[in-house]
């Protein structure tokens, strides 16, 4: 309907349009995480704050044990910032005693789970070499992207180290999407 | 009106639609920033360009005096990237001292001030600890993220220090946001 | 048509709507890079993977040659991540052999070619210098802004140095675009 | 220090117009958003409406909108209330009021009597 | 408009007692704000987004509640508390007040 104007005649075509306002969107926030169990070889999962502070869902877009569920399919934004703190990075201490310097890293890892795969399918990583000279050293890695989703997808955050994830405030550690 | 052709028929339920192309838009760009005062114990907020090069505000978003103005409520998308350059930073020279290493940081905060709480409101925050080998440094720090705003809400940028903040290209440093 | 009821009124002004489904879209992945000739004194540009895993274009969103063909004018929210990675950056060699330490560094730059303009345009661009300590490294350059674009522009993503760029993963390294 | 110090004619006409001005001091006007509260005598606290000077945006009491006007002059870092057709119900002591960075801060108050 | 009913209206408490005043908002608000007003003063902000201590607060004031209910504490009544107590709600158009409630030294 580009440059066209919408008019109400009965031989106007109609595509399925939608009040943006009810879109599935959601924004979660960081909470102190509890260990929990993860698969062999799959990085842990964050879990997360939906509805105090900053943190919402809504229209049909909920969240449940560490995943956001996809009501609706379509092209969604997917975002997640997840900031890392800890003390000096091994490789230094690995370094200064001589051995092989390999770098301890930090990644972050927007993970899809879907009925229609059997495998979780990653579909944003950030990852990071860290190799501080600071004995105490702190960094986001931020991700975003558009992905083609369907209803029932699961999303997660998984991360390297949840030890190592900032939980203070809200407004460094989060994770969001909402369908375009 | 998911999946539902929307023609003019009387027994249509109408949600309330809108073109895209007038929700309020906006992207600012750096300029060279001047001294200005802050609340002790906040950043100081950097102020932009909003009319040459690449920055533009539209359908009644405004900027002024370093603030974004949201005309309306609604979901938007926040996002800014601040480009922070220096020379080596103290924490080296520190270490060489041979005293405590605590690292240099820089730091942005997207802000929200709204006139139903009396609080500035941080919306998101990038902040990595700088500890630099080398003399001169740079790199930058992206946010972006989606909030519930009001309509009165504005929005403005801080930085841990102005005079880190490269403004020098329209394409380092910047802020913007739209309406969902 | 804020917060007013869009019924088949034949008083009621339409403005131009469309679907949110047929707007332009793409999202591009990674792939190994071929060696190509580039303008002097202009980053050379990644090419893409654009249909296969979790590339796709749509609605008349090309991608052809390194560029992503904008086929409506409008308001695009352009991305990029670059993952960069290499081994022990010279900046740290030189500094152990006493010479200036002048650092290395890593730059992604999202760049318009306009015909209306004979001069490529720099939207976005993340540069960070790299000085590091260990052996191996690795980061991501993330990139995210709104931009007015016009039909018949092109899109493209320069980084300053091709072999430094991460194409092992498709959601390590990517670059998309959308009409908002 | 932050100030806001509000002044103005403490004695109005019935059926004419209530002008009171806030000046401040010790912030930017710009950074808040300015409130006018009232208190009549024996009374609660009753919000009268704010204007955000960055922009000049306002929202009032519906209760007192046909006749509230607050406006802002951020080059003399003052807000000025206006009031129309008053009644002896007027008669109050008039605050301005700073919100959006803590701490919320209040005028001392400027008592306005209206009588003929 | 969103009402807020406080109450008591006035109370009279022994110094070193727990005093309590509630706040009832007519529908659900996000925040609740707590003033005091000594006579012919103005008033000054205790507590925000209902239970951050506002800056320079003695520790012994308090807030708490969500929803439509709220309710404001002093641990521990001092002859310095002797004043006016009002609730307030700014989320809703217009920002209304409770009618507030006076606090006495028996």
């Known amino acids: 309907l580009k440059g066209q104007e919408f008019a109400p005649s009965h031989q106007q075509v109609y595509a399925p349009l939608r009040a943006d306002g009810d879109k599935p969107r959601a924004h979660l926030t960081v909470v102190r995480q509890t260990p929990t169990q993860h698969f062999k070889n799959q990085f842990p999962a964050l879990h997360w704050e939906h509805e105090l502070g900053l943190a919402f869902t809504k229209n049909r877009m909920n969240y449940t044990n560490k995943f956001l569920l996809i009501p609706e399919s379509g092209d969604y934004f997917i975002y997640s910032q997840v900031t890392f703190r800890g003390m000096t990075s091994e490789c230094s201490e690995i370094r200064q005693a001589g051995r092989p310097n390999k770098p301890d890293s930090i990644t972050v890892v927007i993970t899809k789970v879907t009925d229609s795969y059997p495998e979780p399918t990653q579909l944003l990583m950030g990852t990071k070499s860290v190799c501080e000279v600071g004995s105490n050293w702190f960094q986001p890695i931020y991700l975003g992207a558009m992905f083609s989703l369907q209803e029932g997808d699961k999303l997660m955050v998984n991360v390297s180290d949840i030890s190592l994830v900032d939980y203070t405030k809200e407004d460094k550690t989060f994770f969001g999407a909402f369908l375009l | 009106l998911k999946g539902q052709e929307f023609a003019p028929s009387h027994q249509q339920v109408y949600a309330p639609l809108r073109a895209d192309g007038d929700k309020p838009r906006a992207h600012l760009t750096v300029v060279r920033q001047t001294p200005t005062q802050h609340f002790k114990n906040q950043f100081p907020a950097l102020h932009w360009e909003h009319e040459l090069g690449l920055a533009f505000t539209k359908n009644r978003m405004n900027y002024t005096n370093k603030f974004l103005l949201i005309p309306e409520s609604g979901d938007y998308f926040i996002y800014s990237q601040v480009t922070f350059r220096g020379m080596t930073s103290e924490c080296s020279e520190i270490r060489q001292a041979g005293r405590p290493n605590k690292p240099d940081s820089i730091t942005v905060v997207i802000t929200k001030v709204t006139d139903s709480y009396p609080e500035p409101t941080q919306l998101l925050m990038g902040t990595k600890s700088v500890c630099e080998v080398g003399s001169n440094w740079f790199q930058p720090i992206y946010l972006g993220a989606m909030f519930s705003l009001q309509e009165g809400d504005k929005l403005m940028v801080n930085v841990s220090d102005i005079s880190l903040v490269d403004y020098t290209k329209e394409d380092k440093t910047f802020f913007g946001a739209f309406l969902l | 048509l804020k917060g007013q009821e869009f019924a088949p009124s034949h008083q009621q002004v339409y403005a131009p709507l469309r679907a949110d489904g047929d707007k332009p879209r793409a999202h591009l992945t990674v792939v190994r890079q071929t060696p190509t000739q580039h303008f002097k004194n202009q980053f050379p540009a990644l090419h893409w993977e654009h249909e296969l895993g979790l590339a796709f274009t749509k609605n008349r969103m090309n991608y052809t040659n390194k560029f992503l063909l904008i086929p409506e004018s409008g308001d695009y929210f352009i991305y990029s991540q670059v993952t960069f990675r290499g081994m022990t950056s010279e900046c740290s060699e030189i500094r152990q052999a006493g010479r200036p330490n002048k650092p290395d560094s890593i730059t992604v730059v999202i760049t318009k070619v306009t015909d209306s303009y004979p001069e490529p345009t720099q939207l976005l661009m993340g540069t960070k210098s790299v000085c590091e300590v260990g052996s191996n490294w690795f980061q991501p350059i993330y990139l995210g802004a709104m931009f007015s674009l016009q039909e018949g522009d092109k899109l493209m993503v320069n980084v300053s140095d091709i072999s430094l760029v991460d194409y092992t993963k498709e959601d390590k390294t990517f670059f998309g675009a959308f009409l908002l | 220090q932050v100030q806001l110090q509000e002044s103005g004619p403490g004695l109005v006409r019935p059926s004419q117009t209530l002008s009171l001005t806030c000046t401040v001091s010790g912030f930017d006007m710009q950074d808040t958003y300015m409130h006018w509260v009232r208190q009549r005598p024996g009374r609660g606290l009753e919000w009268m409406g704010r204007?955000?000077?960055?922009?000049?945006?306002?929202k009032y009491n519906p209760s007192l909108k046909s006749r509230v006007t607050i406006t802002r002059d951020t080059s003399k870092n003052q807000v000025s209330l206006r009031l129309s057709s008053v009644t002896a119900a007027d008669t109050a002591v008039y605050y301005c009021?700073?919100?959006?960075?803590?701490?919320?801060?209040w005028g001392q108050g400027s008592l306005v009597t209206v009588s003929s | 408009d969103i009402q807020m009913t406080q109450s008591p209206s006035s109370l009279s408490a022994s110094v070193g007692d727990r005093v309590t005043i509630t706040c009832r908002a007519s529908q659900g608000v996000e925040y609740m704000y707590w003033y005091q007003q000594k006579p012919g003063k103005a008033p000054k902000l205790l507590i925000y987004g209902a239970s951050n201590l506002a800056s320079g607060v003695p520790s012994r004031f308090s807030g708490s509640g969500s929803g439509t209910d709220f309710t404001f504490t002093i641990s521990s009544l001092q002859p310095e508390d002797i004043a006016t107590y009002y609730c307030q709600q700014w989320e809703g158009n217009p920002r209304t007040f409770g009618q507030g409630t006076k606090v006495e030294i028996k």
């Open positions: 204007i955000d000077p960055a922009g000049g945006h306002t």
């Open positions: 009021v700073r919100s959006g960075g803590l701490p919320d801060e």
